[in-house]
């Protein structure tokens, strides 16, 4: 044959034309639309690496390949049928025409067709191999996917169970928090109840404390009375002992009478060589009864017996007659020595009275009376003063002539009112008079316009309450 030409017709079928002498044979073959062309860059039987395809893509591609396989199979069957039909037709024609020399051509054509069929079969085999390869690969991918899916499912299940656990834990904690809140509310309520109970208790305790304070005051008074009784007893005992020793010494002259050293006031203490400020034990005149007093051994030559001191408001000076009689407070701080002792002492010899004052602005002043004494209790410890000098006013802030002593329970003033009640504290009130060093103690910045405070009128006026006061006595001949 001269040539073999392959071309495409208008409807897209492949035409195989064979020219042999004067005869021309045309074979129309059906085209495999979904097959790759031989020029396609695809290597047959090559094992491809796994591409990271999505599961859905893999399934789609598998379906496409299955379709191609099916189409190929159908095409092969059609081709076989077609060849058989054509061979039959050719053989009939050859037989009819009885052209012997065409047999070789037909055989050649048949051979060519067979070759083509073989080629197509080979190609199909390649395609099959490719499909199998792809299928295997896809199966592997699917397996991997399923494994991955299983793994993910397991993870999801694990996470779900973990979430459930956490939710359980959370709900447990929420319950616990709610329980705690309830508990907290209950606790708060109980605390509030406790607080209320405590407040009630505190107020009860306060009233108890007040009662106890009253009892203490009573006890102090009783104690003072007992002390006095004890001193009296001691005195009696001493007298008896003296009497006994006297009678004994009359019998036995070798027994010597023991001499006791006692001080009537701080001047005597000073003269005995004790020149240091402090608390000393003094003895009542003509008695063994003792009392503790603070001695100022420095101011103005020393020897001063402190009979009153105010300095910080630590001691309540709104006291009873008995308390002012025997004394109260602390000799090293705020105190009242006692009217009875001062009365007895100042009636033994002539004493001077010095009153030292301090205001809240750092100023100091004093009033000195050259003669001072107190009457007996029968005359209400009336004060007697003469000869005023000093810097705390030219006029005496203790009314002249002297007044009786008054306390909250011993009203001896010249007012229709009760001065001790109105101005507080025990003092030699007139009606009520220009002074009261035993008044209410007012702290700084609260000490003005206070008319029931620590007053020394002719130095600071009625409404000024002083910071500190000291009343001291010393024999005039010291």
């Amino acid at each position: 044959y001269n040539n073999f030409r392959k071309s495409m017709d208008s409807i897209g079928k492949k035409q195989y034309q064979v020219q042999h002498g004067s005869c021309s044979y045309t074979f129309l073959l059906p085209e495999m639309d979904n097959c790759r062309s031989s020029s396609s860059p695809y290597v047959s039987n090559a094992v491809q690496r796994d591409a990271p395809l999505e599961y859905d893509d893999s399934v789609q591609r598998l379906q496409v390949l299955e379709n191609i396989m099916e189409n190929n199979t159908q095409w092969l069957m059609k081709l076989e049928n077609y060849i058989q039909d054509n061979m039959k037709k050719e053989m009939v024609e050859i037989q009819q025409n009885a052209v012997q020399n065409q047999t070789a051509v037909m055989i050649e054509i048949g051979t060519n067709l067979l070759n083509q069929t073989a080629e197509q079969t080979r190609k199909l085999t390649d395609v099959e191999a490719q499909v199998l390869n792809q299928t295997t690969r896809l199966e592997l991918q699917l397996l991997e996917h399923s494994l991955s899916t299983n793994k993910l499912e397991k993870q999801i299940l694990d996470q779900t169970s973990e979430i459930n656990k956490l939710q359980d834990k959370n709900s447990f904690l929420e319950k616990k928090v709610l329980a705690m809140e309830d508990k907290h509310i209950i606790q708060l309520q109980s605390i509030k109840e406790e607080k209320d109970q405590l407040q009630v208790l505190v107020s009860k305790q306060n009233s108890i404390i007040e009662e106890l304070e009253k009892k203490i005051v009573t006890a102090t008074v009783n104690n003072s009375v007992l002390q006095k009784q004890q001193h009296d007893l001691m005195e009696t005992v001493n007298n008896l002992l003296t009497m006994m020793s006297t009678s004994n010494s009359a019998k036995d002259p070798t027994v010597a009478k023991e001499e006791q050293i006692s001080f009537r006031d701080c001047a005597e203490v000073f003269k005995s060589g004790h020149t240091t400020n402090g608390i000393y034990t003094l003895t009542f005149p003509n008695s063994t009864e003792e009392i503790k007093a603070y001695c100022d051994m420095e101011a103005g030559g020393g020897g001063w017996t402190i009979i009153q001191r105010r300095e910080d408001g630590s001691v309540d000076f709104q006291r009873t007659w008995k308390e002012y009689k025997v004394g109260f407070g602390n000799p090293s701080g705020e105190y009242w020595l006692g009217n009875e002792f001062v009365s007895q002492l100042t009636n033994q010899q002539r004493y001077v009275l010095k009153i030292h004052l301090k205001d809240w602005e750092g100023n100091e002043a004093y009033s000195l009376y050259e003669h001072f004494y107190l009457s007996s209790e029968e005359l209400n410890y009336r004060i007697h003063l003469k000869g005023l000098t000093g810097t705390a006013g030219k006029i005496s802030s203790i009314s002249q002539p002297g007044n009786d002593f008054s306390t909250k329970d011993g009203d001896n003033d010249k007012c229709i009112c009760k001065c001790s009640q109105m101005l507080t504290g025990g003092w030699w009130f007139d009606a009520c008079g220009p002074s009261n060093l035993n008044g209410m103690y007012y702290p700084q910045r609260q000490n003005t316009n206070k008319f029931n405070g620590i007053k020394w009128y002719y130095w600071k006026g009625s409404g000024y309450s002083l910071k500190a006061t000291t009343m001291m006595i010393r024999p005039a001949d010291f």
């Epitope: 007012c415 229709i416 009112c417 009760k418 001065c419 009640q421 109105m422 101005l423 007139d430 009606a431 009520c432 008079g433 220009p434 316009n449 206070k450 008319f451 029931n452 007053k455 009128y457 002719y458 006026g461 009625s462 409404g463």
Partner: antibody, heavy 122, light 106 residues
Framework: AVQLVASGGGLVQPGGSLRLSCAAS????????IHWVRQATGKGLEWVSA???????YYPGSVKGRFTISRENAKNSLYLQMNSLRAGDTAVYYC????????????????WGQGTLVTVSS | IVLTQSPGTLSLSPGERATLSCRAS???????LAWYQQKPGQAPRLLIY???SRATGIPDRFSGSGSGTDFTLTISRLEPEDFAVYYC????????FGQGTKVEIK
């Protein structure tokens, strides 16, 4: 007997001045705090000022800076100098003695004068 | 401290008991509370001081009581001369009066 007699009241224009006096007798004037108390017609009592025996003075905020209280112990006399008078100062003014001596503002008033009328009007 | 008196007016007949109230805005010491009587055209007159002590020359039908914030003036049997205006006063380092209670004949 203790006696207090107030005088010096009268009609005065707003912004004007007036001086009231109070004569005391029957007690030791130099020992007592003396007060001025006023009463507007049909109204209650209002404390106006006080003076101590040695001249220490006390005022409420309503009159501070406008009124001045003073005394002459030798004459047993008390005074109230009223300046910058207002219509609200119209009242009967009483002088009164404190119940206690040297009491300042811690005493009620045991003796009162009969009062003197002050009218502030234009 | 503000003192509030009640009632504003008390209408009673002679021989009846009169009870006048004085209330302080905060607790005060009874030592520093007084009562006065004032008749028309006259100066006030001290009746009670220290909440319960009668002033010189005051009849015993007048009595005072109370503590803290509540104080009372009692006239046990009203006499014709008792019909007047009554004031309470606080005098603890300051001077304050109540607005008054008028006791009138019924």
């Amino acid at each position: 007997a203790v006696q207090l007699v107030a005088s010096g009241g009268g009609l005065v224009q707003p912004g004007g001045s007036l001086r009231l006096s109070c004569a005391a007798s029957g007690f030791t004037f130099s020992s007592y705090d003396i007060h001025w108390v006023r009463q507007a017609t049909g109204k209650g009592l209002e404390w106006v000022s006080a003076i101590g025996p040695a001249g220490d003075t006390y005022y409420p905020g309503s009159v501070k800076g406008r009124f001045t209280i003073s005394r002459e112990n030798a004459k047993n006399s008390l005074y109230l100098q009223m300046n910058s008078l207002r219509a609200g100062d119209t009242a009967v003014y009483y002088c009164a003695r404190g119940l206690i001596t040297f009491g300042g503002l811690i005493a009620p008033f045991d003796y009162w004068g009969q009062g003197t009328l002050v009218t502030v009007s234009s | 401290i503000v003192l509030t008196q009640s009632p504003g007016t008390l209408s009673l007949s002679p021989g009846e008991r009169a009870t006048l109230s004085c209330r302080a805005s905060q607790s005060v010491s009874s030592t520093y509370l007084a009562w006065y009587q004032q008749k028309p055209g006259q100066a006030p007159r001290l009746l009670i001081y220290g909440a319960s002590s009668r002033a010189t020359g005051i009849p015993d039908r007048f009595s005072g009581s109370g503590s803290g914030t509540d104080f009372t003036l009692t006239i046990s049997r009203l006499e014709p001369e008792d019909f007047a205006v009554y004031y309470c006063q606080h005098y603890d380092n300051s001077q304050t009066f109540g607005q008054g209670t008028k006791v009138e004949i019924k």
